[in-house]
């Protein structure tokens, strides 16, 4: 189920790459975030908290990513026209409960000016 389009700027372009921003509520302590391209899982990141509030970050499908207190950024490099597609942030919230899955996304348009190494 698609809950809706992202209500924020999801794609940030720089240096022939794109940062895909996946937000989550900053109250959330334990979650899994997956980046989907169409229906395919490109990347994922799971944050859990153990005893003594020790934080564990795991990735089964590793991408260059960056975690903040309310977002996960996934980075795609060497953009070309094949990257144009629908991208979705698939968030699974574990803690605090209730367990909740949301899918938000948008279409990544690729323009010549955003392609990697276009002047080379």
């Amino acid at each position: 189920e698609i809950n809706g389009s992202a209500n924020y700027e999801m794609f940030i372009f720089h240096n022939g790459g794109v940062q895909i921003l996946c937000k989550y509520p900053d109250i959330v302590q334990q979650f899994k975030m997956q980046l989907l391209k169409g229906g395919q899982i490109l990347c994922d990141l799971t944050k859990t908290k153990g005893s003594g509030n020790t934080v564990s970050i795991k990735s089964l499908k590793f991408c260059h990513s960056q975690l903040s207190n309310n977002s996960v950024s996934f980075f795609l490099y060497n953009l070309d026209h094949s990257h144009a597609n629908y991208y979705f942030c698939n968030l699974s919230i574990f803690d605090p409960p209730p367990f909740k899955v949301t899918l938000t996304g948008g279409y990544l348009h690729i323009y010549e000016s955003q392609l990697c190494c276009q002047l080379k």
């Epitope: 209500n7 937000k23 900053d26 309310n70 605090p96 409960p97 209730p98 367990f99």
Partner: antibody, heavy 121, light 106 residues
């Protein structure tokens, strides 16, 4: 139906502590987190903190840090909020509220009836 | 702390009149929720995720906005809408409520 029933009104002396209870029914207690919010007379609402029932993780508003303790007893489906070092400004109605999520954020979907705490010498 | 300023603080409307109240955030937020509180009762979830009506809320209510500015609108005021309405942001810690808009009927 889903219900949060809070303990009765309390009158406390300055410097003492109060412990307010919130008994949940109509749903699986550990499947939701519980927040506490207060409302001083004629004033707006103020978020105090929450507890994740299944993990016991707590998160407090820094304004109350050190004075507020939120706990839960899974066996009785009851959440508690204890506020210490009471002062007259803590006179308020205290509410528990169940945590829920929408597509973008979280909110309180069910509230208790409120517990009036009066701090007076 | 993200301060939410609601305006007007008090307003009155005639039955059938359109009503709009606003909530202005000192820092941008991703979404806003609204609660209705009638005198000496607990608040009730009224609108969540900026524009979604909570269960049982009449269709004459709507919510909109983005960034720093959000609003709650009643298309046609009814007597049962008399209450205080609070906006709430859960986007950034510490989570804050607006001071409320008290809606009365003329």
């Amino acid at each position: 139906q889903v219900q949060l029933v809070q303990s009765g009104a309390e009158v406390k002396k300055p410097g003492s502590s109060v412990k307010v209870s919130c008994k949940a029914s109509g749903y699986t207690f550990t499947d939701y987190a519980m927040h506490w919010v207060r409302q001083a007379p004629g004033q707006g609402l103020e978020w105090m903190g929450l507890i994740s029932i299944y993990s016991d993780h707590t998160n407090y508003n820094q304004k109350f840090q050190g004075r507020v303790t939120i706990t839960a007893d899974k066996s009785t489906s009851t959440a508690y909020m204890e506020l210490s070092s009471l002062r007259s400004e803590d006179t308020a109605v205290y509410y528990c509220g169940r945590n829920n999520y929408g597509n973008y954020g979280w909110y309180f979907d069910v509230w208790g009836q409120g517990t009036t705490v009066t701090v007076s010498s | 702390e993200n301060v939410l300023t609601q305006s007007p603080a008090i307003m009155s409307a005639s039955p059938g009149e359109k009503v709009t109240m606003t909530c202005s955030a000192s820092s941008s937020v991703s979404y806003m929720h609204w609660y209705q509180q009638k005198s000496i009762t607990s608040p009730k979830l009224w609108i969540y995720d900026t524009s979604k009506l909570a269960s049982g809320v009449p269709g004459r209510f709507s919510g909109s906005g983005s960034g720093n500015s959000y609003s709650l609108t009643i298309s046609s005021m009814e007597a049962e809408d008399v209450a205080t309405y609070y906006c709430f942001q859960g986007s950034g810690y510490p989570y804050t409520f607006g001071g409320g808009t008290k809606l009365e009927i003329k």
